[in-house]
């Protein structure tokens, strides 16, 4: 939510996803003030004691900052003056998944707004076709997932075919025994069709689709996280 | 343009102490984490800790905790390592090194020309 | 404490030849690992970060990739000067570990 009226200002934040393992950013803006030194920036997250990162008279103020945060936060200093408090988080955790708070103070007045940070595990999924096999096989492999994903295959010619008959997933735990490779493989699959391989957990949603003809064969995958609303 | 100029070589003997200076310029010292690594002759890169000097938090190699202590002096942008009880295995050069990131600790981007620390009786 | 394992401790190669170094990180995934270049006598320099992200200044035939805990550094044509030390550094966690080095020598 947005708070605005008299002493106060407007704070943006947007509803976002971590991959594990990798950066996060926890987007908030406000409305800018003509001078660094008079922007405070607060970051809290609900449950946790000390703050996750705070900002102020132009430089990082680390002294009430919480020990699971030390070292992993950063604003974009050069950006604040412009109005943004977003903050970068290092080598995002499951246990960052929470409620945050975008705490803002500057000569206008002061305002905040709550933001829902999920985190998991979400990659972009590769489909080739699958020359090993016997039969005409489309194999759609991502390496990182979490939560455990459902995967549903479908075609441009055939909308709204099922193929759960004719495809097999399995999930085959990584390494770090947190995240998953997922690999679906389609049977059956004729030319000059195009196939959809789409994975989807409740962060993230991602697509590939391959083009067989009997000239070519085209290739497109994109990645989109679910749930990225604004307050 | 961001620069470590380090203390000259030392001479110790065991069972001494010694300290190192790491004086920063070209960049706000306040608002970037600081390390310190090592390298015995011939030998690869050791990571002894790093210290915030905007605040004085550290972390340290385990191997190193209760010898090494790291500290800054904010009015003349300088980190320090402390080394105790020193044995002829600490001969080494020792580093000094930005962490790029600012208060997010990354990568370190910036180092100074290493200092000689040479333990002997 | 997570371990870095750097292979090969050294490598013979010529110049134009293509080089991989590989670290493998003990336990844990995440992207912080950085390439360092050393010469003797002179201070780690900074090649490669967040895995794949090249330092400014670096030349375009160093890379970086990797993902879990498996990770390479490679140099796609070996130039005279590319002959050094070369260090991957894990930098995600609370304790920093660098691999033990891959000596690159004129073969």
């Known amino acids: 939510f947005g708070i605005s009226g008299r002493h106060s200002i407007t704070v943006t934040t947007v509803a976002s996803a971590g991959n594990i393992g990798e950066d996060g950013i926890l987007s908030c803006t406000f409305e800018p003030d003509i001078k660094l030194s008079d922007i405070v920036i607060q970051w809290l997250k609900e449950g946790v004691i000390g703050l996750v990162h705070e900002f102020k008279e132009g430089k990082d103020e680390l002294s009430e900052q919480d020990e699971m945060f030390r070292g992993r936060t950063a604003v974009f200093a050069d950006q604040v003056i412009v109005g943004n408090a977003s903050l970068r988080l290092k080598n995002v955790q499951l246990t960052d998944a929470g409620t945050y708070k975008c705490y803002i103070i500057t000569s206008k007045g002061k305002g905040n707004a709550n933001l829902e940070y999920k985190t998991g595990a979400f990659s972009m999924p590769e489909v080739n076709v699958d020359y090993n096999a016997s039969s005409e096989t489309l194999r759609c492999e991502a390496p990182r997932w979490f939560p455990q994903p459902t995967v549903v295959w479908a075609s441009q010619v055939d909308q709204g075919a099922n193929f759960s008959e004719v495809s097999n997933t399995s999930f085959e735990l990584n390494s770090e025994n947190v995240t998953m490779k997922v690999v679906s493989v389609l049977y059956n699959v004729t030319i000059n069709n195009t196939y959809s391989c789409m994975i989807e957990n409740d962060i993230a949603k991602a697509t590939g689709d391959i083009k067989v003809t009997e000239s070519e064969i085209k290739r497109r995958s994109h990645l989109q996280l679910l749930n990225s609303k604004a307050s | 343009e961001v620069q470590l100029v380090q203390s000259g070589a030392e001479v110790k003997k065991p069972g001494a102490s010694v300290k190192v200076s790491c004086k920063a310029s070209?960049?706000?010292?306040?608002?970037?984490?600081i390390g310190w690594v090592r390298q015995a002759p011939g030998q690869g890169l050791e990571w002894i800790g790093d210290i915030y000097p905007g605040g004085g938090y550290t972390n340290y190699n385990e191997k190193f905790k209760g010898r090494a202590t790291l500290t800054r002096d904010t009015s003349t942008s300088t980190a320090y390592l402390e080394l105790s009880s020193l044995r002829s295995e600490d001969t080494a050069v020792y580093y000094c090194a930005r962490l790029d990131g600012s208060s997010y600790r990354g990568a370190m981007d910036s180092w100074g020309q290493g200092t000689l620390v040479t333990v002997s009786s | 404490d997570i371990q870095m394992t750097q292979s090969p401790s050294s490598l013979s190669a010529s110049v134009g030849d293509r080089v991989t170094i590989t670290c493998k990180a003990s336990q844990g995934f995440n992207k912080y690992v950085a390439w360092y270049q050393q010469k003797p006598g002179k201070a780690p320099k900074l090649l490669i970060y967040y895995t794949s992200t090249l330092q400014p200044g670096v030349p375009s035939r160093f890379s970086g990739s990797g993902s879990g805990r498996d990770y390479t550094l490679t140099i796609s044509s070996l130039q005279p000067e590319d002959f050094a030390t070369y260090y991957c550094?894990?930098?995600?966690?609370?304790?920093?570990?660098f691999g033990q080095g891959t000596k690159v020598e004129i073969k």
């Open positions: 550094l894990q930098y995600g966690n609370l304790l920093y570990a």
């Open positions: 070209g960049y706000t010292f306040t608002s970037y984490w």
